[in-house]
């Protein structure tokens, strides 16, 4: 059993999130993940989900009673989602930490917009669409 | 020429982001995008970048002088990044709109954590690594 399971159960107790009523009114993430099978689509969604959890954990960083659980889960996210690649994790963190209200950040973002847009679609990089994208609009 | 280019130039004027000094102290997004060649890695990063732009545009939604430019660019992002797929865009928006300080959202997130974690690595879904991932750790 992966180490995160035990620690996630510990967090469930702390957040009182083990009760069946928590699932009322649908899921946050699971329903959305079920919609997307293509790996690149899943990464688009998981990127937002992982950043949500990192933000949530940051908000509870001073709570010693759950620190071990949080650290173990974050470590497992590093392994699973970032493939143990610190550079990938660091680049991701940089992006999540940019402040949208910082004037210098705003100017830089707009300055880079054209180039960012040019790289957004897979075709821009590969020069061709993948066959799977030709069969059905992903 | 894609329609976003003219509108992005318009935003550059509005944000005073055309000057070369804007590029001082490095880039926000372009340097990071340069690091990642594998499509799924790029989607992880681009997901954060696109959500940044959406947040930025939201902050200026009442400014009539740039509304046409913002709408054109958002539309082009829908085409390029979400492949004109409204469901993909809607699911993405849902994820970006969850409040990390909402107690019900926190409880749901922790309730779903074990299942989310189980799906994080590509191997979990496919049972095998893609050959391109075999060449170099992404």
């Amino acid at each position: 059993q992966d180490p995160y399971v035990k620690e996630a159960e510990n967090l469930k107790k702390y957040f009182n999130a083990g009760h069946s009523d928590v699932a009322d009114n649908g899921t946050l993430f699971l329903g959305i993940l079920k919609n997307w099978k293509e790996e690149s689509d899943r990464k688009i969604m998981q990127s937002q989900i992982v950043s949500f959890y990192f933000k949530l954990f940051k908000n509870f960083k001073d709570d010693q009673s759950i620190q071990k659980s949080v650290e173990t889960i974050k470590e497992d996210m590093n392994v699973k989602f970032f493939n143990s690649n610190k550079k990938k994790r660091d680049d991701f963190e940089k992006l999540t930490n940019y402040s949208v209200t910082d004037l210098n950040v705003q100017r830089k973002a707009i300055h880079e917009l054209i180039q960012v847009m040019a790289e957004l679609s897979p075709a821009a990089k590969t020069g061709k669409r993948k066959r799977s994208q030709m069969l059905f609009r992903g | 020429q894609d329609p976003y280019v003219k509108e992005a130039e318009n935003l550059k004027k509005y944000f005073n982001a055309g000057h070369s000094d804007v590029a001082d102290n490095g880039t926000l997004f372009l340097g990071i995008l340069k690091n990642w060649k594998e499509e799924s890695d790029r989607k992880i990063m681009q997901s954060q970048i696109v959500s940044f732009y959406f947040k930025l545009f939201k902050n200026f939604k009442d400014d009539q002088s740039i509304q046409k430019s913002v709408e054109t660019i958002k539309e082009d992002m829908n085409v390029k990044f979400f492949n004109s797929n409204k469901k993909k865009r809607d699911d993405f928006e849902k994820l970006t709109n969850y409040s990390v300080t909402d107690l019900n959202v926190q409880r749901k997130a922790i309730h779903e954590l074990i299942q989310v974690m189980a799906e994080l690595s590509p191997a979990a879904k496919t049972g095998k690594r893609k050959r391109s991932q075999m060449l170099f750790r992404g």
Epitope: P3, T72, E75, S84 | R137
Partner: antibody
């Protein structure tokens, strides 16, 4: 100050076993991944194995996979390397190293090494 | 298998600058951090550059690291060469399957 002290090296016959230990101090042991790196006489550095901070993820070089097992006891601040089916080419100085984060990172601090000799 | 290739040796006079290259065999070297370790004879290695271009505390700013995506290589530059810089230098990064990879090492000789 970070201190890493390897022990358990020695002379062993081909096919035999050894267990190396690395006693760590001066940092929060469970928060960092740990690695073993070896250096054959007159040769370069060769990474052997690594383990994440919690011990939940382990990584091995192809040359030792299936023969060596890395483990850690966070309550004792100790890293281990169980080496089975030893070969002459496993002869080397074995270094224990602290990684720079909780998965694979840069090798921030190194021990002085312990020598393993595999010979009949 | 992913490999990192370094020159066997470089030599230069005191006060001069030496650059050691580290070429990746496949993939994109920019997709992982590159580290550089110094090893003096009879001692354990120590990091002089980590995460592409960061210097650990205590390492002089004469040491610098860089990545060149176009040539898929990393470089360690030592400026103002000193006799104490004479050592073996190893670059290190990672391969696809979470294996740590070292270059073969470069012997730096101060003439």
């Amino acid at each position: 100050e970070v201190q890493l002290l390897e022990s358990g090296g020695g002379l062993v016959q081909p096919g035999g076993s050894l267990r190396l230990s690395c006693a760590a101090s001066g940092f929060t042991f469970s928060s960092y991944a740990m690695s073993w790196v070896r250096q054959a006489p007159g040769k370069g550095l060769e990474w052997v194995s690594a383990i994440s901070g919690s011990g939940g993820s382990t990584y091995y070089a192809d040359s030792v996979k299936g023969r060596f097992t890395i483990s850690r006891d966070n309550s004792k601040n100790t890293l281990y390397l169980q080496m089975n089916s030893l070969r002459a080419e496993d002869t080397a100085v074995y270094y224990c190293a602290k990684d720079g984060w909780n998965a694979l990172g840069w090798l921030e601090s190194w021990g002085k090494g312990t020598t393993v000799t595999v010979s009949s | 298998n992913f490999m990192l290739t370094q020159p066997h040796s470089v030599s230069e006079s005191p006060g001069k600058t030496v650059t050691i290259s580290c070429a990746g065999s496949s993939g994109s070297i920019a997709s992982n951090y590159v580290q550089w370790y110094q090893q003096r004879p009879g001692s354990a290695p120590t990091a002089v550059i980590y995460e592409d271009n960061q210097r650990p505390s205590g390492v002089p700013d004469r040491f610098s690291g860089s990545i060149d995506s176009s040539s898929n290589s990393a470089s360690l530059t030592i400026s103002g060469l000193k006799t104490e810089d004479e050592a073996d230098y190893y670059c290190q990064s990672y391969s696809y399957n979470n294996q740590v990879v070292f270059g073969g090492g470069t012997k730096v000789t101060v003439l």
